[in-house]
C-alpha cells in the first residue's frame, strides 16, 4: 500500500499520505483566476501541433479549509485545480465563455497536475491538548499531457517534478492550546 490519493471534489486527484475522507471543499473565497500560462510557443497550425509543450490548460485557484476528523485548519489553504480542455496555447481562451473552445481530434490531451507542494497546516480541534498539525499536498502547477488509449488513470496521479527544496530553518513550534480555546476557535471558524 503506497501513498493514497484523495479526491478534492474539484476535478483533480491529489496524492496524500494516508487516506483521509474529505468533505467537499468550502469554496468560500473561490478565486477562479483562469490563467492559460502553461503553454509554450504558439503552434504553426492549430490542427497540426504534435508537441505537448505547445498546449496549455487553465489553472483555477480556490481556497478551502483542511479537515481531519473533527479538526479543521486554522486558516484556509489556496490551491490549484487543473481544469478545462487542453488546446493550442494561442487559441485557448483566458476565461470561460470568451473565445472558442478548440477540441483536438485524435490523441487525448489532459490537463493534469505538474508539480506539487506540501503545506503544513495547524489544526483546530475540539478538546485535545497536543498541538496538532497536518501536511497537505497541494497542486502547484498544471500541464497538458498527451494520453493514448494505453494510458490508464494512474497516469493522472504521478507526482510530477519536485519543487526545489527550501533551506532548512528553525521555526518556533506551535504551543499546545487548551481545549476551551480550541473549541472557541473552531466555533468561530464556522
Amino acid at each position: 500500500q503506497g501513498w493514497q490519493a484523495f479526491k478534492n471534489d474539484a476535478t483533480e486527484i491529489i496524492p496524500e499520505l494516508g487516506e483521509y475522507p474529505e468533505p467537499p471543499p468550502e469554496l468560500e473565497n473561490n478565486k477562479t483566476m483562469n490563467r492559460a500560462e502553461n503553454g509554450g510557443r504558439p503552434p504553426h497550425h492549430p490542427f497540426e501541433t504534435k508537441d505537448v509543450s505547445e498546449y496549455s490548460c487553465r489553472e483555477l485557484h480556490f481556497t478551502r479549509y483542511v479537515t481531519d476528523g473533527p479538526c479543521r485548519s486554522a486558516k484556509p489553504v489556496t490551491e490549484l485545480v487543473c481544469s478545462g480542455q487542453c488546446g493550442p496555447a494561442r487559441l485557448l481562451p483566458n476565461a470561460i465563455g470568451r473565445g472558442k473552445w478548440w477540441r483536438p481530434s485524435g490523441p487525448d490531451f489532459r490537463c493534469i497536475p505538474d508539480r506539487y507542494r506540501a503545506q503544513r497546516v495547524q489544526l483546530l480541534c475540539p478538546g485535545g491538548e497536543a498541538p496538532r498539525a497536518r501536511k497537505v499536498r497541494l497542486v502547484a502547477s498544471c500541464k497538458c499531457k498527451r494520453l493514448t488509449r494505453f494510458h490508464n488513470q494512474s497516469e493522472l496521479k504521478d507526482f510530477g517534478t519536485e519543487a526545489a527544496r527550501p533551506q532548512k530553518g528553525r521555526k518556533p513550534r506551535p504551543r499546545a492550546r487548551s481545549a476551551k480555546a480550541n473549541q472557541a476557535e473552531l466555533e468561530n471558524a464556522y
Partner: antibody, heavy 118, light 107 residues
Framework: QVQLVQSGAEVKKPGASVKVSCKVS????????QHWVRQAPGKGLEWMGW????????EYASKFQGRVTMTEDTSTDTAYMELSSLRSEDTAVYYC???????????WGQGTTVTVSS | DIQMTQSPSSLSASVGDRVTITCRAS??????LAWYQQKPGKAPKLLIY???TRLSGVPSRFSGSGSGTDFTLTISSLQPEDFATYYC?????????FGGGTKVEIK
C-alpha cells in the same frame, strides 16, 4: 510505494550514544512528519518524538528530553535519531515511522535493534 | 501521562470467530485513538485512526468504535492472517501513549 529502510543493529556500551538512520522513499521526507517509536524486548510500544523535516521543528517525549535528537537530511530523504547516555533499559527495537500528521503513524520502518550492554 | 489499558492482554480464538478488544484511557481522549497490528518480528501497521476510520486497504472485517475513554476494536470474522498483537494509541495529549497490547492467538 512508500518504504522506510533503517540502519542495521547496534551494540553499545552504557554511557555511549547511538545514531539510527531511516531512509524514506516514495515521497519527499519534507512533505511528512517523522516519528520515532521504540519497543523493549517483549514489551509494548513507546513514542519518543516527532520532527518536521521541512522546518526542523521537533517535539520530544519528556522522558527522552535532553537525551534524544531527531534530525533529517532532506537532500537524501533520510531521518536520524540519536540517543545519548545509553543505559541497559534503552535496549530495544527502534522504529522510524512517517505520516502526514503529528499524532499517528502511517508507515513504519523495519526496526533497528539497539543493545546496550557492558 | 495518559494511561492506555487494553483488555484482554491475550485471547485464543478460531478462524471465523468474532473478536473484540477493548482499550480504556485514563482520561477523556475524545476520538484521538488509533489501532495498530503487529506480527512477530515485524513493524506495526496502522489499521484504524480517529477511533473508527479504517485506513485504505484494511479489510472491512476490522472496525473501531468508541469515544471519550472507552474504545473497541472488532474483528468480525477472524482470518488466519489476523493472528497478531494489537495496540491502541492515543493522540490526544503529549506524550502519545500506547496500550500494553492484546495478543490474538490460535485456539
Amino acid at each position: 510505494q512508500v518504504q522506510l529502510v533503517q540502519s542495521g543493529a547496534e551494540v553499545k556500551k552504557p554511557g555511549a550514544s547511538v545514531k539510527v538512520s531511516c531512509k524514506v522513499s516514495g515521497f519527499p521526507i519534507k512533505d511528512t512528519f517523522q516519528h520515532w517509536v521504540r519497543q523493549a524486548p517483549g514489551k509494548g510500544l513507546e513514542w519518543m518524538g516527532w520532527s518536521d523535516p521541512e522546518i526542523g521543528d521537533t517535539e520530544y517525549a519528556s522522558k527522552f528530553q535532553g537525551r534524544v535528537t531527531m534530525t533529517e537530511d532532506t537532500s537524501t530523504d533520510t531521518a536520524y535519531m540519536e540517543l545519548s547516555s545509553l543505559r541497559s533499559e534503552d535496549t530495544a527495537v527502534y522504529y522510524c515511522a512517517t505520516g502526514d500528521t503529528t499524532y499517528k503513524f502511517d508507515f513504519w520502518g523495519q526496526g533497528t535493534t539497539v543493545t546496550v550492554s557492558s | 501521562d495518559i494511561q492506555m489499558t487494553q483488555s484482554p492482554s491475550s485471547l485464543s480464538a478460531s478462524v471465523g470467530d468474532r473478536v473484540t478488544i477493548t482499550c480504556r484511557a485514563s482520561q477523556d481522549i475524545h476520538t484521538y485513538l488509533a489501532w495498530y497490528q503487529q506480527k512477530p518480528g515485524k513493524a506495526p501497521k496502522l489499521l484504524i485512526y480517529w477511533a473508527s476510520t479504517r485506513l485504505s486497504g484494511v479489510p472491512s472485517r476490522f472496525s473501531g468504535s468508541g469515544s471519550g475513554t472507552d474504545f473497541t476494536l472488532t474483528i468480525s470474522s477472524l482470518q488466519p492472517e489476523d493472528f497478531a498483537t494489537y495496540y491502541c494509541q492515543q493522540g490526544d495529549t503529549l506524550p502519545y501513549t500506547f496500550g500494553g497490547g492484546t495478543k490474538v492467538e490460535i485456539k
